[in-house]
Each structure stands twice: as C-alpha cells, then as structure tokens.
C-alpha cells in the first residue's frame, strides 16, 4: 500500500474565520496573519505578557480522525522574544503548550481544561528567538508532534499559553503510514511519513515486552516517505529476568537469573541459591543461607558463623580476660566479628541476668575483630557466664539459635571501696585526732587502716604513714601552727582500698607559756 | 466599553509640579501597560514611556527621564504622570494610551482625551 | 534610536482618490510599524498595526505594506472623514513616531 499523506485540517486553507473557542475571551483572539510568504492569513495570536499566571486556553474544532491511528500535529508559529518587551521579564515566557482531548462526538464550546492530555511544551527554535532588541527579528517556527495512538472518533487540539507573545500562524493535522515493525527489540508504530520539509521522520521506538531502552542510546527508526522504515539507530535490551531470542525477550528459566538487563544471557544460580520460577532478576537463597543488603545477585548465598572454638579465660580478682580460636565455620564470608555478652548468675539455680552497663570491656564488646578480650570492674565473689559468638554480614538475617562458646566463672576477692566520714575529733598544737567510717564495701575482712599525712606546703613530696586496726587515731608529734593534709585508706588482704578525700587541718599555735597537753587517745602513736 | 479618562487642563507657573491622572475603564487594569505621549502646539507626537501596570516598572523615553515620573494606584486603575520643575516648554497636551503589544508589533489602541498642561509666568 | 521619516509632509487629493503614504526608517526594522490618525482636536486613533492588521472598527480601505526600511499606507478610496494628519511609529528598544503626513482636500 502506498503511503499517504491524509490531510484532517489545514488552517490556513480556510478563508473564512477559523472560529475556534478562546477560554477566555480576551486570551487567544482570531486576527489576519502573514504566513512565512507574507500571504495574508488566519492566524490566533496571545500577548498576555504582562500579568502573571495566565491561563489562556485555544481549542480547535472537532476532527474527525478518519482511518487514523497515529496523528501528526504542524504547528508553524511565531514566537516573541520577551526581552524585546520593557518591563515584563517577571511574567513573559517563550513556550505554550500543547493539549488534545479523545471523543467520539463534538462536545460543544465549553473547554473543560482537567481532560485534555498534554502533548507538550512547545517552544521556539533558539536561533529563531534571538533577535537583535533594536529590531525584533520574529521568524516562523515549524514544530511538529505525534499524538496516538488514538481509540475514538476523534479529537479535539488545544493550546494552552501561560503568558507568550505568540501568533500560530498555520495548523496542519494529518497522517500517513509506516507500517508497524520489530528492530532490535524495539517496536516501531505505524507512523506518520516525512512531511513536505523532510524525507525522513525519526520516530522513537517502544521497547517490546520485557524489554527497557540501553542507556542513553533510545531506539530511532526512520520513515520515509515511502512508508519504509530506514537507519535503525538506538536499541532495547531485554529486562532483568528476560533474554533475548529473536525479536522477543524470553523469561530466564528455572534456576537460572538475569539481575540487570546490561547482562546479555541468564545465569545459572549461585551456590546455596534457587530460582523456582520463570522470569528470575534473582535468585533465592536456600533455607539457612541469606544475602547481606550489600551483596551483589552473582554472589553465593551464605550462613552465620558457627561458634568461636577454644575459649580460655584467666581471672585476676575482678578482671577476666578471654581468648579464643575462630569459629570452624565462617559461614563462607570473610567479615567475621566477635562479640560479648556478660551474665552474672546467682549461687542457686543458676539464674542469670545482663550485666549491665558499669562492666568495662577492652578493646570493646561489640564488633571485636581480634580474638581475645578484657572484661573489667566486675563484682569480687560473683558468678559470671560469658557468652563469645562469633558474628558476619547475615547473622542477624537468621532467625535459628545463635550459636556461641560460653565460660562460667568466679571473680575473687576485691580490694575495699573508699573510706568514707573522715571527721576531725580534736586539734591540738602538735596532734591531730581523726575518725572515719568502714567502707561501704570491705570486700572482704579490713586487717587495717593505713594514714597518710603531709604539711600541706610540702605538697606531698615528703609525707608520713600510720597504721591502725580501728576506725580513729591519734596523730602526734606534729608542728604547731601548720596546716597538714590527711587521708585514709582501708587494707584487706585483698590489697588496699582508694585513700579518702583530702582532709586539711590546721594544729594550733603555739602558746606564749608552757601549756599542758593531753595525751593521744589512740593506743597507736606516730614513731618518732 | 474601555475608555480611559484625563482630567481637564492645567496652568502653571515655572518650577511648579503637575500631576496628570488618568482613570483606566472596561478592561483589567494592569492587564495592559500604559503609555505616555506628548505633542507641543502644532507640532508631532512625541513618545515619553510607558509603565507595566502589574509590576509598576516604568521605562522612560530619552529626554524624559529625571523631572518625569509615571506611577499607579492599581485600586482605582488610575496612572499619573507627574511632571517636577515644570519650564515653559513643558507646554503640551498630555496622552495617556493603552499599549496594545502583539507578535506582530505594538501600538497603541486606546487613548485618553489629553490633557493640556500649559506652564507660563 | 531608529529615526522614522514620513513623506509627503502634505498629501493633497481628491474624495475616493488612492492616497498613498511613505514611512521610511534609518534602519531595518522587523515588523510593519503602527499607524495613526489624528483629526484636529482629537486623541490620536490606531488604524492598523502589526501584520497589517486592521484596528477595531477601521474600514478595509486603510492597508499597511512594506518591509526592511520602507513602509507605506494606503487608503484605497478618500472618504472625506478620512483628512487628517497620519502618523506611522516604530517600536524598537525605544518607540518614535514619524513627524506625521497631513493629508488634506485637493
């Protein structure tokens, strides 16, 4: 069948007033024109420029789209550039848009704007918007648009401007035909021919099923005026989950997958992973294996380690150090982690609760990449259950038992905690005596107090020490008028406590005459 | 129908101000820009400026810019042309013109009556 | 600044005489420059502007032409309501009228 151009409107063919719906009436006005000729004609012309938010609507007269499918849309137009009008940069534009509307019958005069689709933005050519200012170069812009395919009778064009200077000087609706084809995976419509401009029309191609456009490289067939279809440029690929054969996509079969259509063919499945259908992007993992959000599709599916392998330990009072060798299985990644969790049972029935927080851990308790670890500040003569579970990139996918190595211990015994209450009793000229309180925690049976005293000038680079079995003592042979610094601390066989606070006490003056002087009442004197 | 009205005519001495309304009617105001014209007794029309009735830009012909100011009162569509430090040469009727722009080109499709200012001691 | 000259200064004819009006530009301007007609007495009045477009209720007697510098008006048959002064105005970056055609009863 030879192809035709079939003419549906020409309005510049028609002499009489074209009297098609302007919406609102001051918009779009009907005036004679000059086509590229300069033959008087028909034109519809708009120069709203200078309110913002226009909204001027056109709408041709019903056409009847005849045998069409596919519909081609002249638009020769002259456009203004707005920087040849004073003052109206703010709301002056350079497109307008182009709508149509689908029915079976004409609808009458009302534009209802919410059903018409539109085709697009229509602007001019930029070398023909770039005149000198001084003269206002407007030369006859030529676009062209396809719009189908169409399903009813026919149709309705409008044009939309939201604030141009612009005359559309000719409209021309029409069809020809290249028949329908498949090239490279693309399907190339029946389509419009060249028109009298050119001899060739590039038309975009639709991907098949299952197919998408190669990036940046868009399928494009040409028509000829002879409704043959030349120079294939662009094509599709077929989609992830699809290959191709023929001018078709097919489903990649069971177990196997096709992630990206940049992939040519489809893949047989990685380890440990299946595809039970048709049409696969990826691959299940099989039950007990998992993919980590990171891992590519082409990647084996893989498994949380199993437990850390000889677990030792070694006490030190109330630090514990652990050591252990990595685990048998590392579930097939190489992002093994270890990490603690600490328990402290009671002495019956075993019950165990989380630490808590004032346990420390060296280097850290959490994401270890060593294997070995200090755990620190725990309580003298408790039981403790330490849990090492060794931890990669699907472990917390898997909903089945964590597998771990685990130690049970008992701390010794702690040094005491700080004395606390350190009071001065009396203060004499040359004897200082104290009292304090046991510590909150001896951790054990106090063997003694240890005093540590120091004129507070000599700022501990000399000081003195005295020892004592109770909680007050007498200290003596001190120099009268000095100000002395003092601080307690409780001994366990255990080791020593922190000393308390620092206690300032100043002995008195000495008198003028000799006074009498009472003696300590500690047992315990300072040696002299 | 779109009428655009001018008050009637002044006298005025030299050095004195005059300001010149012009009243818009039958269509949106700052639709359509506004422009100034003067013609001098027996002599041709001269193009002043024109003002962007929705923005209130005004652009000034050469020769007409310092002692010429264009402004608007949009809430009664009325322009003004007022004229400072008024010289005896100032004397002229005043136009007001509604600008009409198109594709095609601009003009000026609707006018006021004119105002005749006449400026002597 | 485009300068527009119009000639004859005085256009004398007769009633359903062709008058014909020159409007010449000191350079290329783009578009058919507007035309007015002013009678004494009055406002000025457009008469056609752009692509040789008529203004509301001017009679298809009047018809502008011409391109490039060169621009003409012409009125195909006198009536008398017609004798006036007729000025043509270019639009560039700055508007200027032409110093204007009388045209009066021969």
């Known amino acids: 069948q030879a192809a035709k151009e079939v003419l549906l409107l020409d309005s510049k063919a028609q002499q009489t007033e074209l009297e098609w719906i302007s919406s609102p009436p001051s918009g779009w006005e009907e005036i004679s024109g000059l086509d590229e000729n300069y033959t008087p004609i028909r034109t519809y012309q708009v120069c709203q420029v200078m309110e913002p938010n226009q909204n001027n609507w056109l709408r041709t007269n019903w056409i009847s789209k005849g045998n069409a499918q596919r519909i081609f849309v002249e638009l020769k137009f002259t456009l203004r550039d707005c920087n040849s009008l004073p003052g109206v940069l703010g709301t002056c534009k350079e497109t307008f848009n182009l709508y149509y509307y689908e029915t079976d019958y004409d609808t009458g005069r009302n534009i209802r704007e919410n059903l018409y689709v539109k085709i697009d933005t229509i602007a001019a050519d930029e070398s023909f918007t770039q005149g000198d200012l001084g003269e206002r170069k407007m030369k006859l812009n030529t676009e062209v648009r396809e719009i189908g395919p169409l399903s009813k009778k026919g149709f309705y064009l409008a044009f939309q401007d939201v604030g141009a200077c612009i005359a559309l000087v000719s409209v021309k609706v029409y069809y020809k035909k290249c028949w329908s084809i498949v090239e490279n995976l693309a399907v190339f419509p029946d389509t419009v021919t060249g028109s009298e401009f050119s001899s060739l029309v590039e038309v975009r191609g639709t991907c098949v099923s299952s197919a998408e456009e190669e990036a940046e490289n868009s399928p494009r067939m040409h028509c000829s005026a002879e409704g043959e279809w030349l120079v294939p440029i662009g094509k599709c690929i077929c989609k992830a989950g699809y290959q191709q054969k023929g001018d078709t996509c097919e489903p990649c079969g069971r177990r196997f997958y096709k992630s990206s259509s940049q992939d040519l063919q489809c893949s047989r499945c990685p380890t440990h992973s299946f595809s039970d259908r048709e049409g696969s992007s990826r691959c299940e993992c099989e039950d007990g294996y998992y993919r980590a959000p990171s891992d590519p599709p082409y990647v084996a599916c893989t498994r949380p380690p199993s437990a850390p392998q000889n677990l030792i330990f070694n006490i030190n009072q109330t630090t514990v150090s652990l050591e252990w060798s990595p685990p048998a299985d590392n579930g097939g990644r190489n992002d093994v982690t270890y990490r603690i969790l600490c328990k402290r049972c009671s002495w019956e029935q075993g019950e165990c609760v989380p630490c808590g927080s004032n346990i420390g851990y060296m280097p850290q308790q959490t994401g270890l990449e060593d294997n070995y670890v200090t755990v620190m500040d725990l309580l003298a003569h408790a039981n403790y259950t330490f849990e090492v579970e060794a931890v990669n990139g699907v472990s917390d996918l898997s909903r089945s038992q964590r597998l771990f190595a685990a130690v049970s211990i008992t701390t010794g015994q702690a040094a005491p905690s700080q004395v606390s209450g350190v009071m001065k009793e009396r203060v004499l000229q040359r004897s200082v005596q104290l009292s304090w309180q046991e510590p909150e925690h001896p951790n054990g049976v106090i063997t003694e107090y240890e005093i540590k005293y120091y004129e507070k000038d000599q700022r501990e680079r000399t000081y003195s020490t005295l020892k004592t079995k109770s909680t007050s003592a007498s200290i003596n042979n001190l120099k009268p008028g000095t100000v002395y610094v003092f601080q307690i601390r409780a001994v366990t066989a255990a080791g020593y406590g922190n000393y308390s606070p620092r206690l300032d006490v100043a002995t008195l003056e000495e008198a003028s005459g000799k006074m009498f002087e009472a003696t300590a009442v500690s047992s315990e004197q300072n040696p002299v | 129908q779109v009428q655009l009205l001018q008050s009637g005519a002044e006298v005025k001495k030299p050095g004195a101000s005059v300001k010149v309304p012009c009243k818009a009617s039958g269509y949106t105001f700052t639709s359509r820009a506004m422009s100034w014209v003067r013609q001098a007794p027996g002599q041709g029309l001269e193009w002043m400026g024109w003002i962007n009735t929705n923005t209130g830009n005004p652009t000034y012909a050469q020769g007409f810019t310092g002692r010429f100011v264009f402004s608007l009162d949009t809430s009664v569509s009325t322009a003004y042309l007022q004229i400072s430090s008024l010289k005896a040469e100032d004397t002229a009727v005043y136009y007001c013109a509604r600008v009409r722009l198109t594709v095609y080109g601009d003009g000026m499709d609707v006018w006021g009556q004119g105002t005749l200012v006449t400026v002597s001691s | 600044e485009i300068v527009l000259t119009q000639s004859p200064a005085t256009l004398s004819v007769s009633p359903g005489e062709r008058a014909t009006l020159s409007c010449r530009a000191s350079?290329?301007?783009?578009?058919?420059p507007p035309w007015y007609q002013q009678k004494p007495g009055q406002a000025p009045r457009l008469l056609i502007y752009?692509?040789?477009t008529r203004a509301t209720g001017i009679p298809d007697r009047f018809s502008a032409s011409g391109s490039g510098t060169d621009f003409t008006l012409t009125i195909s048959r006198v009536e008398p309501e017609d004798f006036a002064v007729y000025y043509c105005?270019?639009?560039?970056?700055?508007?200027?009228f032409g110093q204007g055609t009388k045209v009066e009863i021969k």
């Open positions: 752009g692509a040789s």
């Open positions: 105005q270019q639009y560039g970056s700055s508007w200027t």
């Open positions: 350079q290329s301007v783009s578009s058919n």
